[in-house]
Interface confidence: medium
């Protein structure tokens, strides 16, 4: 049967009902990654903020990456998102510095609150910055007399918090 004949068509070809030769090679800029296909898929084009990581072949789709200053998001790099600097987060208005009490040590993602050392019964050994979390040290009881323990405030922009 026609179905049986189509199953013989290998990857890189499609089952062409309009031609006596049942298996036809995929046209330029298209591919079929499995056998028995009735059509070839159009190759993905890596344009704009996308750059080609792997060229399309008759048996596999092109793979895209992001140009410098952007990073991939989503399955198979379906989106490119702008990089920010450490100590910033990407908002709908672009990159913005982390609010006091929060940090981001990467070029992507959002600012996160500093660790609250006191919740673990510890003290702040090294203060946090926009780029780095606080470093928690020994518990206050382990410190020599006169040592102080600082607890960072809640992040200024955590929903529901109202810095004065």
């Amino acid at each position: 049967s026609l179905q049986d004949l189509c199953s013989n068509c290998p990857a890189g070809t499609f089952c062409d009902n309009n031609r006596s030769q049942i298996c036809s090679p995929c046209p330029p800029n298209s591919f079929s990654s499995a056998g028995g296909q009735r059509t070839c898929d159009i190759c993905r084009q890596c344009k704009g903020v996308f750059k080609t990581r792997k060229e399309c072949s008759s048996t596999s789709n092109a793979e895209c990456d992001c140009i410098s200053g952007y990073h991939c998001l989503g399955a198979e790099c379906s989106m490119c998102e702008q990089d920010c600097k450490q100590g910033q987060e990407l908002t709908k208005k672009g990159c913005k510095d982390c609010c006091f009490g929060t940090f981001n040590d990467q070029k992507r993602g959002i600012c996160r609150p500093w660790t609250n050392c006191s919740l673990d019964g510890k003290s702040v050994l090294v203060n946090g910055t926009k780029e780095r979390d606080v470093v928690c040290g020994p518990s206050p009881a382990d410190l020599s007399p006169g040592a102080s323990s600082a607890t960072p405030p809640a992040p200024a922009r955590e929903p529901g918090h109202s810095p004065q």
């Epitope: 998001l73 208005k93 922009r157 004065q164």
Partner: antibody, heavy 118, light 108 residues
């Protein structure tokens, strides 16, 4: 306690103008982005415009671009929306909201009703 | 423009039941930028969930959010009488900021 109080709504004829105000208290107004969001009677929410803490960066929905202007006076802790060339489809309750950018809108005013009708 | 489509339009349930609300984006949205709101008649919306899964201050733990990419879910584990309202999802990932059309949770 964070409070946002809108005023300036009312009945206006098509083509007319109106200026909405939003008085903010209970937080450092000058540190936050602010937005206007509207809701037509019986309908869903529609973002209208936003402004950054200094007032230098503004953005608008396509439906109001060129007709509405958002502004703020940090010395008065007040947000404004100047609405010109009003249309029937601008009829809605207008809310001002504190805009946390990444995190959405965490505080909203009670809203002020704008009715555009002849 | 990122279009957010909520389903179902209306959910008829009884107090004590579990409510599952869906929000589907027309393109991928980083989960950090997805929020959920509750609105009762005559009131302003109230922020429930930000960052797709973090509860806002004062929100009971029966409310939870999940999802990533294009599919997000708000779950109310056991409906209380005060939970019957309209719920909206919203993205602040890119301009224009957009809301879903809302899901009404009504008493069966």
């Amino acid at each position: 306690e964070v409070q946002l109080l809108e005023s300036g709504g009312g009945l206006v004829q098509p083509g007319g103008s109106l200026r909405l105000s939003c008085a903010a208290s209970g937080f450092t107004f000058s540190s936050y982005d602010m937005s206007w969001v509207r809701q037509a009677p019986g309908k869903g929410l529609e973002w209208v415009s936003d402004i950054d803490p200094t007032g230098s960066k503004t953005d608008y929905a396509d439906s109001v671009k060129g007709r509405f202007t958002i502004s703020r006076d940090n010395s008065k802790n007040t947000l404004y929306l100047q609405m010109n060339s009003l249309r029937a489809e601008d009829t809605a309750v207008y809310y001002c909201a504190r805009d946390l950018m990444v995190y959405g809108f965490d505080y909203w005013g009670q809203g002020t009703l704008v009715t555009v009708s002849s | 423009e990122i279009v957010l489509t909520q389903s179902p339009g209306t959910l008829s349930l009884s107090p004590g039941e579990r409510a599952t609300l869906s929000c589907r984006a027309s393109q991928s949205v980083s989960s950090s930028y997805l929020a959920w709101y509750q609105q009762k008649p005559g009131q302003a919306p109230r922020l429930l969930i930000y960052g797709a899964s973090s509860r806002a201050t004062g929100i009971p733990d029966r409310f939870s959010g999940s999802g990533s990419g294009t599919d997000f879910t708000l779950t109310i584990s056991r409906l209380e009488p005060e939970d019957f309202a309209v719920y909206y999802c919203q993205q602040s990932y890119s301009y224009p900021v957009t809301f879903g059309q809302g899901t009404k949770v009504e008493i069966k």
